[in-house]
């Protein structure tokens, strides 16, 4: 049997026998274009493609539409994988989305959506989510039904304001909504009563800016 040399996601890499977490090269569906991603091969059976990570504020997340489309940051640290790749990938097969969160008091929680996909750029990478479970709130902190993606230079929210400019970061803003994992990073003891922090309302409430976040996807049939 011929060895697979290109992989569309970290689940394929895991199944090929490469089971160590780290940076791997993925290939866009139906293309030769490549992208580097962090693969988490440890959490919940492995095979997770990390699409977002925050941990220390080292990367500026107040970026343009083009940057969110193509991705930015470093897969070894803070980064955004890229809306275009995620849209193409999740449009091919059914994926689950796991969001892992850490607060400043040493607590961890997660939200798991049993079906996740992003629409194409023509639909502003609108997010679609169903089937929430997990410990980070019984109500989805990503507004339902899903919103279009907005950035500082592309305002697609439902607010009379420009949420991305007001709150910082690109996100699926509603008006503006109960979450923003791409908000301004605030250090410990400066992370409460924040209007533009890293927010997941149905876990930590209003104004609390989180210490670390990871968004990762995996095929539902993994």
């Amino acid at each position: 049997k011929e060895e697979q040399t290109t992989f569309r996601d970290c689940a394929e890499i895991f199944k090929s026998g490469l089971t160590t977490s780290g940076i791997y090269t993925l290939t866009f569906p139906n293309s030769t274009e490549e992208i580097k991603a962090y693969c988490d091969m440890d959490v919940g059976g492995g095979g997770w493609t990390v699409i977002q990570h925050r941990e220390d504020g080292s990367v500026d997340f107040q970026r343009t539409w083009k940057e969110y489309k193509e991705g930015f940051g470093s897969p070894l640290g803070e980064y955004w994988l890229g809306n275009e790749f995620v849209s193409q990938l999740t449009g091919q097969h059914r994926y689950v989305l796991k969001i892992q969160l850490k607060d400043w008091e040493g607590n961890e929680a997660h939200s798991l959506y049993d079906h996740f996909y992003l629409a194409g750029e023509e639909s502003n990478y609108r997010i679609h989510l169903t089937g929430l479970t997990g410990t980070a709130g019984k109500i989805s902190s990503i507004s339902q039904p899903g919103s279009d993606f907005s950035t500082k230079d592309s305002d697609n929210d439902k607010c009379i304001c420009k949420c991305s400019q007001m709150l910082s970061g690109g996100w699926w803003f509603d008006a503006c909504g109960p979450s923003n994992l791409n908000g301004q990073y605030y250090p410990q003891k400066q992370n409460t009563n924040k209007f533009n922090g890293i927010k997941w309302y149905y876990w930590k409430g209003s104004g609390y800016s989180l210490k670390a976040t990871t968004m990762m996807i995996r095929p539902a049939d993994f």
């Epitope: 439902k158 304001c161 008006a175 503006c176 009563n193 309302y201 209003s206 104004g207």
Partner: nanobody
């Protein structure tokens, strides 16, 4: 640093009055809406009243209409809640909270709870004879 400090709570007899104050610092009231919320033991936090646009727009929950009055003094960066004809069911911890005034959904007048990102520590109001 954004801070909200409530004061004015206390014990009052049914039918009595209290005036709560919410002193804001770290931002100016001109660009923000301030809401008053309350939470009774074992119950959800509920919106009581809110104000924005230098008092040009105000909101009251049905349960307090005609009894409570919200006002602001922007020179003191303080919002007040005058509570008259108090009832035992008004007993709760009262909180003030802030939200950027522009964070409004098209066609809506007021804000969901999760949009209020800055909160005070609360002041206890007890209505009892």
């Amino acid at each position: 640093e954004v801070q909200l400090v409530e004061s004015g709570g206390g014990l009052v007899q049914p039918g009595g009055s209290l005036r709560l104050s919410c002193a804001a610092s770290g931002f100016t009231l001109d660009d923000y809406a301030i809401g008053w919320f309350r939470q009774a033991p074992g119950k959800e936090r509920e919106g009581v009243s809110a104000i924005r646009d230098n008092g040009g727009s105000t909101y009251y929950a049905d349960s307090v209409k005609g009894r409570f009055t919200i006002s602001s003094d922007n020179s003191k960066n303080t919002v007040y809640l005058q509570m008259n004809s108090l009832r035992p069911e008004d007993t709760a911890v009262y909180y003030c909270a802030a939200v950027p005034a522009g964070r409004l959904r098209f066609g809506e007048q007021w804000y969901p709870l999760y949009e209020y990102d800055a909160w005070g520590q609360g002041t206890l109001v007890t209505v009892s004879s």
